[in-house]
Amino acid sequence: DSSKWVFEHPETLYAWEGACVWIPCTYRALDGDLESFILFHNPEYNKNTSKFDGTRLYESTKDGKVPSEQKRVQFLGDKNKNCTLSIHPVHLNDSGQLGLRMESKTEKWMERIHLNVSERPFPPHIQLPPEIQESQEVTLTCLLNFSCYGYPIQLQWLLEGVPMRQAAVTSTSLTIKSVFTRSELKFSPQWSHHGKIVTCQLQDADGKFLSNDTVQLNVKHTPKLEIKVTPSDAIVREGDSVTMTCEVSSSNPEYTTVSWLKDGTSLKKQNTFTLNLREVTKDQSGKYCCQVSNDVGPGRSEEVFLQVQYAPEPSTVQILHSPAVEGSQVEFLCMSLANPLPTNYTWYHNGKEMQGRTEEKVHIPKILPWHAGTYSCVAENILGTGQRGPGAELDVQYPPKKVTTVIQNPMPIREGDTVTLSCNYNSSNPSVTRYEWKPHGAWEEPSLGVLKIQNVGWDNTTIACAACNSWCSWASPVALNVQYAPRDVRVRKIKPLSEIHSGNSVSLQCDFSSSHPKEVQFFWEKNGRLLGKESQLNFDSISPEDAGSYSCWVNNSIGQTASKAWTLEVLYAPRRLRVSMSPGDQVMEGKSATLTCESDANPPVSHYTWFDWNNQSLPYHSQKLRLEPVKVQHSGAYWCQGTNSVGKGRSPLSTLTVYYSPETIGRR
């Protein structure tokens, strides 16, 4: 209630002679600060004096001074909330009740705390989980109701007297709620720990033994078994007898059932600790063990490998891989059930023994077509020789061999002929399924392996074929040697290198790109007229009249070919100039007279110049000179000059006569 002082501290504190005691304590006074504090040992209230009697262990005065004999007991509190105490060392006769007499200005209070001091260090207490199972991690706890700042202690774990390897976690509590030291050890017990003694040992700071607690481990585990076999090596021959015995070395709790297993499968009607096998067969070879169960579960013994020995059985051959590609590697494996394993092998190819081959495997690094056939083997061990099995077939596949392209036509072949070729080969595995031809063309294949070239081209030089199964084998190309008339006939100017001017020396060449056969004849023509039979056509001094369209022909025994018409252009200065007059060379004054400069030139005249009868140049640049209105004084001789890139030419004089008009004559 509100009339009480409020204290918090452990109800009882434990210690032993020579140790110390630390008393955590808090309080709240009814009013004001603490003015006086006395620590009594076993206080008793005296009704007569209205005071407490008993041994005063500690007393604080108003001036705060403490007598020197009180140093064993220390008040570590304050005037308003902390009332912590320390007694160091603590003695056996300190056991009993401690009384904390508190006085404030107006209020008083006596708070009691129990102190239990034993003669010797008391033992810690080991706490175990309700059940321990093998290989399942458990936590072992060692608890001691003691802790004091001035007296360090340690808790150590031992198994059968030997310190345990596992790391323990030690914790301490010095609070108003509890005072203790605790050590926790995480531990995965094995079945072999069953019945073993675990100790928690209390030691002082120097590791000196103070006290301990011990427990015996009860580790639940499946039955632990040992198997024994006669004969001890478990190697027998067909018809022999074998005995196996199962012994339980440990089980917690007790076992309940027994059974036997072969290769992991339970043997029916075998529920005793002894297994008798009479007149064994090779099928009884295998791994045997016994299984015994308890409430935790089944336990199994180690496996015993029973080997029933026998001579090799008929062998089979495994080929890696068939079909095999020529040039690849192949491995043959002789497979024969036998115990012990065969020590020697004999190999056969197509029924004939293969010399020097005595291993289980035969390796051929580079397979050739003749390696194909049936492979068989015989295995042998100490008990005898097996029989030869049916064998395995090796199929060696390879591209078609010795492929050739054959021309079926009579020779020579001429351009435009129909040519038939066949593709032949010597052998092939697998069979040839298709053929390829080079170069590709829009050609006919009337039957497999036959090619027909209609209208053979002049440039069909060589043909090659390939016979194909899974692979293609190409034959060497065969030359068709097609004969044809001369090709690409054209006229080429050899000289001059630039344009042809009148008077130049000119050479034309009749060129062709190819001809088969090579022997050729030449013909030159102009406007259907034969000019020459040489490869060149020569002009010592070309004239404008030589200009025109030229063609050359080249022929061989196959035929003749003409060039495209080639135009020979001769450049020459203006010539044959003359002045023509319109409407005529006699014109009436006042009318219009047009003078035209006519010429023959190649290239055409680019510039005209006009002159009068005194060779005075007139200011006209055109082919036509127009005088309008024409005057009588314009009568006279006129001439023109034409200019092109080659040169100049001039006309002869042409006379213009301008006569008076009737009006003028009338005026005179």
């Epitope: 009068d612 640049h621 055109s622 036509k624 004084q633 006279g636």
Partner: antibody, heavy 127, light 111 residues
Framework: EVQLQQSGPGLVKPSQTLSLTCAIS??????????WNWIRQSPSRGLEWLGR?????????DYASSVRGRVSINVDTSKNQYSLQLNAVTPEDTGVYYC?????????????????WGQGTMVTVSS | QSALTQPASASGSPGQSVTISCTGT?????????VSWYQQHPGKAPKLMIY???NRPSGVSNRFSGSKSGNTASLTISGLQAEDEADYYC???????????FGTGTQLTVL
Amino acid sequence: EVQLQQSGPGLVKPSQTLSLTCAISGDSMLSNSDTWNWIRQSPSRGLEWLGRTYHRSTWYDDYASSVRGRVSINVDTSKNQYSLQLNAVTPEDTGVYYCARVRLQDGNSWSDAFDVWGQGTMVTVSS
Amino acid sequence: QSALTQPASASGSPGQSVTISCTGTSSDVGGYNYVSWYQQHPGKAPKLMIYDVSNRPSGVSNRFSGSKSGNTASLTISGLQAEDEADYYCSSYTSSSTLYVFGTGTQLTVL
């Protein structure tokens, strides 16, 4: 330095004759490498060549087809001048009239450009 | 005889180049190498700048140059200056009875 000096009235009545004179200094009208030209300029027709006269062994003249029949160029060699007569004028003939020389020889090669111009005469055809 | 075709206007900043074209036919520009170019300032008579396609009279700046391709002639003025602002006309000899034909004119503005 060749100079061309123009003279003549600035106003002419429609249907009358326009008459302009071009006096030459620094060159002779009788030069056999020159021609003497009349050119006019108006906002509607731009620059327009009207005709020319020149002397070689005799006098020659050429006219633009647009004015042929109502134009003539006359020469006065004694005064070294030439004139333009344009008959039956209309307001369409309003513009600035120029005389100009063409020198046809440039060294050894032919040439053809109006290299010397008169100052121009503004002629208005209006009643 | 119709006039030679020129752009109505052209412009450029000082220091820049400008080119004026002049298009005719094979009877004039294309047929003869007698193309000339004239500069005309307001109220003044035309002044010959280029003759015979690409020749420069003495006294004319070498910033002015002429050329011809087919039926089109061109005048190029490089390094434009304020005094280049004027009207420019081309002219050509022609094979018709009207012996000379002029261009429509181009007004050049120096920005």
